[in-house]
């Protein structure tokens, strides 16, 4: 029997302080550059070594960034999203969505801790 891959989605508020070389990450996505099918959201594509994000340790490659300093990133062109980060100031608050891959057992099997509903 094949296993099933599920995702555990969590949200987190991450406060970063801009370092000497900036925030230290790259993004993909936007209404003109869909990275995930049927989703024009903004995703972290690269965390730069020794940058502010890497030193903080919470932001991960693959995270979806929902807002910057309270400003929603929905329905933005890619470059508009980039500009938002560049103009975000010294202290930057990110609302992010982490997707953690969870490998379940074979289909039809329910583990001890799983809800029975």
């Amino acid at each position: 029997m094949n296993g099933r891959v599920d995702y555990l989605v969590t949200e987190e508020e991450i406060n970063l302080t801009r370092g000497p070389s900036g925030l230290g990450f790259n993004i993909v996505g936007g209404t003109d550059q869909q990275y995930v099918s049927n989703d024009s959201g903004i995703y972290v594509s690269r965390i730069k070594e020794n940058g502010a994000a890497a030193l903080d340790g919470r932001l991960q490659e693959g995270d979806k960034i929902l807002s910057v300093n309270g400003q929603d990133l929905k329905n933005l062109l890619h470059q508009d999203a980039v500009d938002l980060f560049r103009n975000a100031g010294y202290a930057v608050s990110l609302r992010v969505q982490h997707r953690l891959q969870v490998q379940n057992g074979p289909i039809g099997h329910r583990g001890e801790g799983d809800p029975s509903g």
Partner: nanobody, 125 residues
Framework: HVQLVESGGGLVQPGGSVRVSCVSS????????IGWFRQAPGKEREGVSC???????YYVDSVKGRFTISRDNAKNTVYLQMNSLKPEDTAVYYC????????????????????WGQGTQVTVS
């Protein structure tokens, strides 16, 4: 395994033209910024031109109007067409790739790049 291979350099007369190419393998160009950089003997590597992940082109002032960057995602290739060449354009030309767009600086910043080719020599003489 990400790999970048440059080609197309050579010896050119002043005022002449040459096109250098950068072929990528191990990744799909679509979401990558690609930069062209050059390094003359005894000098630091400097940005020349780049094209970001949504196709926007950037040039340093010294090459504006003479150099043109373009990309062919289907061929996984980025080109730098260099016209009206000058002796000061003599250098080893490198291409580099970066996944996505840096939130800190434009694609002309060499510090942003993770992957580099081995370079191709262009001599204007």
């Amino acid at each position: 395994h990400v790999q970048l291979v440059e080609s197309g350099g050579g010896l050119v007369q002043p005022g002449g033209s040459v096109r250098v190419s950068c072929v990528s393998s191990g990744f799909i160009l679509d979401y990558y910024a690609i930069g062209w950089f050059r390094q003359a003997p005894g000098k630091e590597r400097e940005g020349v031109s780049c094209i970001d992940s949504v196709g926007r082109a950037y040039y340093v002032d010294s090459v504006k109007g003479r150099f043109t960057i373009s990309r062919d995602n289907a061929k996984n290739t980025v080109y730098l067409q260099m016209n009206s060449l000058k002796p000061e354009d003599t250098a080893v030309y490198y291409c580099a790739a970066d996944f996505g767009s840096s939130v800190d600086s434009t694609c002309l910043n060499k510090q942003q790049y993770d992957y580099w080719g081995q370079g191709t020599q262009v001599t204007v003489s």
